[in-house]
């Protein structure tokens, strides 16, 4: 049948209209809609949301919108008991204490419910000790603390600035270092852009300004007392002690004015090097403890937050494939907030309302995907994934079997130089042939191709003449479709300059800052940013959904393979003696990416010359394209993750944010030289590039013909 | 089975250049990733280069980077390293390598003056 089938729209139309359809107009009354109150998850407001956005998606004319709800572990500080730090004298007393909120932003003075700052899951404790100063906590950092200048950060609390990785694996990192509690802080290095003023008259984070977030490492497992299985009515619940990924130790955030009152005390060791030295006027002294005149002054936490099981809610709107209405293409973002979420999530939220209304439009006009679209809007992203993974879980077996691709819609910009996409090798070419046919929004690339300008600005470190594509890690919705169900997924956002601006992430995130006149006035004002993602966004999943041969290339896999290959090979030739005494070869591998190659490329060959009107031939090398992503899924998932299951993508165990190419391998060579039995370590280095290699060879052969 | 034959070592001056070679037999080259490792008098093995299956991905250890280039010509089967700006510590018998299993003989470099 032709992919036209309940349409009245010529293909070629079909993408056009779509696109023309898209109206910047649009996005920015919407994102001003989403913006005006704090949608929290677990809360009335972010309850109300979800029903006005249900309502306004069966506007739209999608065929259904239901609410999906879940119980899961939230967590929130105590109203009448707030969190703050202080420094104690020697007799106790509270000589500083750290501020219990932040100050609002302008014409958000009255509004009410605004979370203060605080770190999600955070249990509850006093610890009162001295102070340890250690960088970004990320394990280099620890390695230095530890191996090189003998510190001991056991029973002491560590101050560690955000930035560089997810600070869930700061707090894990804190944790096995013996710490008792972690203060974090945002330095203005990181989070100050020079040359900019902090909101309200720029987009830099004032000094009273703090990043909130959660501090879990739930290792894609989703609501903490319900792994694997969907938090339903009838859920069994573990009890607290044996949640999944809760911090040990209380954890609070606070900015850079009560982090200088902290660190200008500091004393002890000296910084290692100029890495470790912000931009306070402090000397950024390790510790630990303070210094002479203050050496008998403490740091003292006081955490009260609570954790609670709390109901969300998912919308999960369809619109219905007129072909193949047995294979889903997901188009997901959340809609929960810190605070206002000016840019997360809401600048995401309003582009995926704008492409729902969009093809609503097309649908009233009587056209139908050939395949099925499926619209979410996620609760609970802030507080772990949750609202994703928990309908994941409870739709594995549907996913599993009909999942062509899932494409996030987080925040649509982190800054406005030019494109940043991490997706899956299948979806390279998509991207490719997608933005070649999209206007650049650029300055000085007037009449030129989004994907000219990408490829000006963010060229490939590998490719001459192509845009960089980076690896999925985590920290978003994507997360349990790609690294647990192993389904195609891919994420597009506007990003600032990595080389100009080596500040973590942009300097407002998480904070009451991040207002709708913070996009309005300094990052889109015309939002022809916000457009052109919309326009990616929604070209990428009006491609998968209605291509008559799914828009995969699996010949980019290949190459990749073989690139991930050559790089783990070198970090273990790294210890020649080593590979040599335990005889360690890279043969099967090597040799299992050079099969993948070749049939990867005869498939390829296939896929041009079969004949496109044979119904049952057509699907056949659909689902080998659709099935390849799930092939590269170990049943038994990576080594104490069972919930990353990707064998060839992870995120890495050292930043949840980052993606780590063939982890199980990465991660048996990492920090080896220190392993008690060596024997033992590089028997698991052999043992996970037979994982490796043997995933290779299985994934390739499903797409030798069939018989 | 498979076989690689080093050449190419001598005696050279401080600051002088040579060109290592390996010629590799047995396997199909072209499909795996390479390495150079030496080992210096009465010390254990060292990592010095390793590079994939074009010359666009190559690894250095950090006391040869900006001094020495591996390179490989698949149509030869042949490995390369180029060694410029010779140091008295790079003295060596430097070995190409397959991986853990599959070594050459080695060949020796000698850096003095």
């Known amino acids: 049948k032709s992919s036209n089938e309940a349409t009245n729209i010529t293909p070629k139309h079909n993408m056009k209209a779509f696109l023309d359809e898209l109206k910047a107009e649009n996005i920015k009354k919407f994102l001003y809609n989403f913006t005006q109150i704090p949608h929290l998850a677990g809360t009335e407001q972010n309850f109300q949301l979800a029903k006005q956005i249900q309502s306004q998606w069966k506007e739209f004319g999608l065929d259904s919108v239901e609410l999906a709800h879940y119980d899961v572990l939230l967590s929130y500080p105590n109203k009448t008991h707030p969190n703050y730090i202080s420094i104690i004298n020697e007799d106790g007393n509270e000589i500083f204490n750290t501020s219990l909120f932040e100050p609002p932003p302008p014409g958000y003075e009255n509004v009410s419910d605004i979370v203060p700052p605080f770190s999600a899951f955070s249990p509850q404790g006093m610890p009162e000790g001295d102070l340890v100063y250690v960088n970004y906590a990320r394990t280099e950092d620890f390695f230095k603390l530890e191996r090189d200048m003998k510190i001991n950060c056991s029973g002491k609390i560590v101050i560690a600035r955000y930035g560089k990785v997810f600070r869930g694996n700061k707090v894990k990192n804190a944790q096995l270092a013996g710490a008792k509690g972690v203060i974090l802080y945002s330095d203005p290095a990181d989070y100050f852009a020079p040359g900019v003023k902090s909101y309200p008259d720029g987009w830099n984070l004032p000094g009273g300004g703090v990043q909130r977030g959660n501090i879990l490492n739930l290792n894609g497992a989703g609501d903490p007392l319900t792994p694997g299985y969907p938090a339903n009515e009838y859920a069994y619940r573990r009890g607290i002690a044996e949640a999944v990924g809760l911090p040990s130790i209380p954890v609070h955030p606070i900015g850079y004015y009560d982090a200088q009152k902290l660190l200008e005390k500091m004393g002890g060791s000296a910084p290692p090097d100029s890495s470790w030295r912000g931009s306070l006027k402090v000397p950024y002294n390790v510790g630990p403890g303070f210094t002479g005149n203050f050496s008998t002054q403490k740091v003292k936490m006081h955490i009260h937050s609570t954790n609670e099981v709390t109901r969300i809610y998912n919308v999960i709107g369809t619109l219905r494939g007129a072909v193949e209405p047995d294979r889903y293409v997901i188009l997901g973002g959340h809609r929960d907030s810190w605070v206002f979420g000016g840019i997360d999530p809401q600048s995401g939220a309003a582009v995926v309302h704008e492409i729902v209304r969009s093809f609503g439009t097309l649908k009233k006009e009587g056209w139908r995907p050939r395949r099925t679209i499926l619209f979410a809007s996620w609760d609970a992203e802030e507080f772990g994934l949750l609202g994703s993974t928990e309908w994941a879980e409870e739709n594995s077996r549907l996913l599993q079997e009909r999942g062509v691709a899932y494409i996030n819609a987080d925040s649509s910009i982190e800054g406005n130089y030019t494109l940043r996409v991490d997706c899956t090798p299948l979806m390279y070419s998509l991207v490719h042939n997608l933005t070649k046919e999209l206007k650049s929004p650029d300055e000085g690339f007037e009449g030129k191709s989004l994907y000219e300008s990408w490829t000006k600005k963010s060229p490939s470190p590998e490719f001459s003449g192509m845009p960089r594509i980076s690896k999925l890690g985590s920290g978003n919705d994507f997360e349990v479709f790609f690294q647990r169900l192993g389904i195609a997924s891919g994420r597009a956002r506007y990003t600032k300059n990595w080389e100009t601006n080596k500040f973590s992430g942009y300097p407002l995130y998480h904070s009451v800052y991040e207002t709708y006149e913070l996009v309005e006035k300094f990052y889109d004002p015309m939002f022809k940013y916000h457009l052109t993602v919309a326009q990616v966004r929604g070209g990428m999943v009006f491609e998968l959904a209605n291509s008559i041969v799914l828009p995969f290339d699996c010949r980019d896999y290949a190459v990749v393979l073989r690139k991930y290959a050559d790089k783990i090979y070198s970090i273990s030739m790294k210890h020649p003696q080593e590979m040599k005494t335990y005889s360690v070869s890279f043969d099967s591998l090597f040799s299992a990416v050079k099969n993948f190659t070749e049939i990867a490329s005869k498939f390829s060959e296939r896929l041009q010359d079969f004949d496109k009107s044979n119904p049952i031939v057509l699907r056949m090398m659909n689902d080998q394209l659709m099935f390849l992503e799930r092939a590269f899924i170990d049943p038994l998932g990576l080594p104490d993750r069972p919930f990353y299951r990707h064998v060839i993508y992870a995120p890495s165990s050292h930043n949840k944010y980052a993606g780590e190419s063939f982890p199980g391998i990465y991660d048996a060579l990492f920090d080896i030289e220190s392993k008690v039995d060596p024997s033992k370590a590089w028997g698991e280095v052999k043992r996970q590039i037979y994982v490796a290699a043997f995933t290779v060879q299985a994934a390739a052969e499903t797409l030798s013909e069939v018989a | 089975q498979v076989q690689l034959v080093e050449s190419g070592g001598g005696l050279v001056q401080p600051g002088g250049s040579l060109r290592l070679s390996c010629a590799a037999s047995?396997?199909?080259?072209?499909?795996?990733?390479m390495s150079w490792v030496r080992q210096a008098p009465g010390k254990g093995l060292e990592w010095v280069s390793s590079?994939?299956?074009?010359?666009?991905?190559?690894y250095y250890a950090d006391s040869v980077k900006g001094r020495f280039t591996i390179s490989r010509d698949n149509s030869k089967s042949t490995l390369y390293l180029q060694m410029n700006s010779l140091r008295a510590e790079d003295t060596a018998v430097y070995y190409c390598a397959k991986d853990g299993v599959h070594w050459g003989q080695g060949t020796l470099v000698t850096v003095s003056s």
């Open positions: 590079i994939g299956d074009n010359n666009r991905t190559t």
């Open positions: 047995g396997f199909t080259f072209s499909s795996y990733a």
